[in-house]
Interface confidence: medium
Amino acid sequence: TVPPMVNVTRSEASEGNITVTCRASSFYPRNIILTWRQDGVSLSHDTQQWGDVLPDGNGTYQTWVATRICRGEEARFTCYMEHSGNHSTHPVPS
C-alpha cells in the first residue's frame, strides 16, 4: 500500500466565489474516497466535480475533486480522504 499525497488549492471563480480543488496523488491501490465536506458532512454529488482515477506512470494513481464555495466560508470546508483503511482531513488554504 502506498498512501496518497493530498494537496488542496483554491482559485478565483465568479465574484464572491472560489473553486477549491483537492488532489490525491501517488497512491496504490486505486480505490480511494475523496470528497468535500461542509461542517463535517459530505456535500452531495451534484455539487462536486470529480476527476477520473488515473495511473500517473509510476505504478500509482492520481485523482481530484473540486467544488465551488462562497469566499469567506473556507473554514467550513474540508477535503476528506480515505484510502486502505486510513483517513485524513485537509483544510482550504487561507
Epitope: 461542509q38 463535517g40 458532512v41 452531495s44 455539487t47 474540508t78 482531513t89 483544510p91
Partner: antibody, heavy 122, light 112 residues
C-alpha cells in the same frame, strides 16, 4: 463513546474574560468536531461555534464572533473556549459537545460534557 | 436565522400515555447535501441534553424504540408511544442544516 470533562464553575466580574476547557478521552480527538453551546437558566440552547480538532478550523454563530474564541490542544485532547468582555447576559451554563460524523449517524451533538456554570456578577 | 417553534410549551401526560410533540421550522431545512438534519434532544433537570433522534427519524444508539420521529420540509413530530417516568423533562428540536444551527424553545413533558 468516550468522555468529555468540563472545567468547574466560574464567578467572574463584568468586563473580564473566562477560558473554559473540555478535556476529552476515549476517542481519537483529531478526528472530531467539537461544538460549544450556551444555556441560560430556564431557557433553550444556543449554538456558539464549532472547532475541528484535526485542523483548528472553526465556524461561528455570527452572534458570538466578537465574544467567543475556540482553540484546541491536541497534545492533551482538550478543547477551549475563551469568552471575553463578559456581561450579566453571559451568565449561563456552557456545554461542549462532540459531533458524530464518523460513525453511521451524522448527528450534531451526540456526546455532551456536563456543563460549566459561568456567573457574571460585580 | 431559522426559527424553530415547538408546541405545546407544556405537555401533561399520564404514565403509559402516548405523547406527541411538534416542531415547525421557519423555512425548509434540507441541507445542500440532500439530508434533513433535524434532531430531538431530551434534557432532564440538572443534566446535559441527550440526543434521541437524528436526521428526522433515526434513533440514536441506546434510545428505546418507544421514541419515533417523523416529518419533512418544515413540520416535524416526535412521538413517545408509552411515556415512562424516565421520559419526563424538556424536549428540544434542533436544525443543523443551515448556519447558525438553531434550537426550538422546548416542550416540557410532565405528569398530569
Amino acid at each position: 463513546q468516550g468522555q468529555m470533562q468540563q472545567s468547574g464553575a466560574e464567578l467572574v466580574k463584568p468586563g473580564a474574560s473566562v477560558k473554559l476547557s473540555c478535556k476529552t478521552s476515549g476517542f481519537t480527538f483529531s478526528d472530531n468536531y467539537i461544538s460549544w453551546l450556551k444555556q441560560k437558566p430556564g431557557q433553550s440552547l444556543e449554538w456558539i461555534a464549532w472547532i475541528y480538532a484535526g485542523t483548528g478550523g472553526t465556524s461561528y454563530n455570527q452572534k458570538f464572533t466578537a465574544k467567543a474564541q475556540l482553540t484546541v490542544d491536541t497534545s492533551s485532547s482538550t478543547a477551549y473556549m475563551q469568552f471575553s468582555s463578559l456581561t450579566t447576559e453571559d451568565s449561563a451554563i456552557y456545554y461542549c459537545a462532540r459531533h458524530d460524523y464518523y460513525g453511521t449517524s451524522g448527528a450534531w451533538f451526540a456526546y455532551w460534557g456536563q456543563g460549566t456554570l459561568v456567573t457574571v456578577s460585580a | 436565522d431559522v426559527l424553530m417553534t415547538q408546541t405545546p410549551l407544556s405537555l401533561p401526560v399520564s404514565l403509559g400515555d402516548q405523547a406527541s410533540l411538534s416542531c415547525r421550522s421557519s423555512q425548509n431545512i434540507v441541507h445542500i447535501n440532500g439530508n434533513t438534519y433535524l434532531e430531538w434532544y431530551l434534557q432532564k433537570p440538572g443534566q446535559s441534553p441527550k440526543l434521541l433522534i437524528y436526521k428526522v427519524s433515526n434513533r440514536f444508539s441506546g434510545v428505546p424504540d418507544r421514541f419515533s420521529g417523523s416529518g419533512s420540509g418544515t413540520d416535524f413530530t416526535l412521538k413517545i408511544s408509552r411515556v415512562e417516568a424516565e421520559d419526563l423533562g424538556v424536549y428540544y428540536c434542533f436544525q443543523g442544516s443551515h448556519v447558525p444551527w438553531t434550537f426550538g424553545g422546548g416542550t416540557k413533558v410532565e405528569i398530569k
